[in-house]
Interface confidence: medium
């Protein structure tokens, strides 16, 4: 059935998915919170324009009495169950915001035909990528792994005189919903990453991982993994590490790194860090407050959804143009908006772009310290450290195969 | 630990004007939003300006709006609130904060418009 959008004469809504299946176990309160402040300043930059319009959203909540994993499994049904409710109350927004699992956004683009845009704070899976009026606000798959395939061909920096080609991937199948994807696109032997490596091995199980930490006859001295410090000290704890071993810790939405009294764990020495630059943190603000770092982001992405929108209802009322168009489903990408803590720029499939930060552990200080950044929007490698105290001979990092000569 | 303290306040004639601060410490003030609130006496809480981490976009409610100015002094950890041409319903206890919803408050600095 044809579904009307409340989107014309002056009066904006905007359709936000309350699903309880979620990329992060984020009480709903504080996503409505988050909305809620972004239409305040939504609101305030219309005005500020001279637009005397109506901005609101709608909360569309599931029962939760059939999809309550709480966890992405059952998302898929619970996605298009909300889109049927909206279809049945014949009422929709200018835009859909949520979800944020990738199977119910994948499912609910391919099963509808949608001629409004979806904006959400996840979908990280590759089967999200090229979707032409989905917008992720946070760093999919796609992006870390142009990171790392630039990274391992980097050989000309001072702390990095090798090219690697070779990786071990950790997963073990209990990782959160960015992780999982993250790692998935890692695994997949059509990816861009499995493409542009000569070897590549999952590790499954803990042993093998543990195993591996002073094999003699391994493949690779790389291992990827992805979760936060606790997590790597749960598979590892204090055990030897063979010196040329190299754990990369992807860890991109937790800024506990870069908080002032944090001192890194010895078991941190032989890891660089992947996370995301920290801008300006939200602290104290009425959707952050008493979250983790983790669920902040994801907060936060849900605010800047609601500001994306603005500023694209604003540039297409100022242009005289209609809402209700396949042009305006189709906008939301290739751009750069005023986001709640600074300016946010989206690529020409319309992701997120952002700085990713590598951290390694100084030996000295046992403090975290930037060894470079990557810029995902042009994606180049940015060196910080040109001399970092690293745990490795010569304070460089190993060639990825133990006792292969210089490249 | 996070610190708001407010000053400034006062009793004025209507029309006249008075010139709030308030110092924060505790938090890297110049990457948030900062707000003013004010508690008019009997009543709740409400909205009444909002500035940018940056300065760069600052937002009134109505009812002040052309007689207010927020505005912020990354440098020295402040926040200020220019209120011009008084009225008797400005008279409140205005509290500045990161979000007017937030759980840390400064103890407020009272303004009272009378004649």
């Known amino acids: 059935s044809q579904v009307s959008q409340n989107c014309h004469n002056g009066s904006y809504e905007i359709s936000v998915l309350m699903m309880g299946n979620s990329a992060f176990a984020e009480p709903l309160k504080n996503l409505e919170d988050a909305v809620n402040e972004g239409l305040e300043i939504v609101r305030g930059r219309l005005q500020n324009a001279g637009l005397n319009v109506t901005v609101n959203a709608t909360f569309m909540y599931s029962d939760g009495l059939i999809h309550n994993s709480g966890d992405c499994r059952s998302s898929t049904c619970e996605g298009l169950d909300l889109l049927r409710k909206i279809s049945n109350a014949q009422r929709m927004g200018c835009v859909l915001i949520g979800p944020s699992c990738t199977y119910s956004t994948f499912q609910m683009y391919l099963d509808t035909e949608l001629s409004y845009p979806m904006i959400s704070a996840g979908s990280f899976g590759l089967s999200c990528d090229y979707k032409e009026t989905l917008t992720r606000l946070m760093s999919p798959a796609r992006k870390l792994m142009y990171f790392l395939v630039n990274f391992w061909k980097t050989n000309d920096l001072p702390f990095k005189t090798y090219s690697w080609s070779t990786s071990y991937v950790y997963k073990n199948g209990t990782e959160t919903e960015d992780c999982f994807w993250y790692l998935n696109a890692l695994e997949a032997s059509v990816s861009y990453f499995s493409h542009e490596l000569g070897f590549k091995v999952v590790l499954r199980q803990d042993k093998e991982f543990q195993d591996i930490l002073m094999d003699h006859n391994r493949k690779s001295n790389v291992i990827i993994m992805c979760g936060g410090p606790e997590f790597l000290y749960k598979l590892k704890g204090d055990r030897a590490v063979a010196e040329d071993i190299v754990i990369i810790l992807v860890d991109l939405f937790n800024d506990q790194y870069f908080e002032d009294n944090v001192t890194a764990p010895d078991y941190m020495k032989n890891v660089l860090v992947l996370t995301l630059s920290p801008g300006n943190s939200l602290l104290n603000s009425s959707f952050s407050r008493n979250l983790s770092p983790t669920k902040r982001d994801f907060a936060l992405a849900y605010l800047n959804g609601i500001l994306l929108f603005g500023h694209m209802l604003k540039i297409f009322l100022e242009n005289g143009e209609n809402i209700t168009t396949p042009k305006f489903a189709h906008a939301f990408r290739n751009l750069t908006f005023e986001g709640y803590d600074g300016p946010v720029t989206l690529d020409d499939w319309g992701d997120v772009d952002s700085t990713m930060v590598l951290l390694y552990t100084s030996v000295d200080t046992k403090k975290y310290k930037v060894l470079l950044t990557y810029d995902t929007h042009v994606n180049k490698t940015y060196p910080v450290d040109m001399s970092p105290t690293f745990t490795w001979k010569n304070s460089k990092l190993p060639n990825d195969i133990t006792g292969r000569g210089p490249q | 630990q996070v610190q708001l303290v407010e000053s400034g306040g006062g009793l004025v004639q209507p029309g006249g004007s008075l010139r709030l601060s308030c110092t924060a410490s505790g938090f890297t003030f110049s990457r948030y939003w900062m707000s003013w609130v004010r508690q008019a006496p009997g009543k709740g809480l409400e909205w009444v300006a909002k500035?940018?981490?940056?300065?760069?976009?600052?937002y009134y409610v109505d009812s002040v709006k052309g007689r207010f100015t927020i505005s912020r002094d990354n440098a020295k950890n402040s926040l200020y609130l220019q209120m011009n041409s008084l009225r008797a319903e400005d008279t409140a206890v205005y509290y500045c904060?990161?979000?007017?919803?937030?759980?840390?408050w400064g103890q407020g600095t009272a303004v009272t418009v009378s004649s």
């Open positions: 500035i940018r981490h940056d300065g760069g976009e600052k």
């Open positions: 904060a990161t979000d007017y919803t937030r759980d840390v």
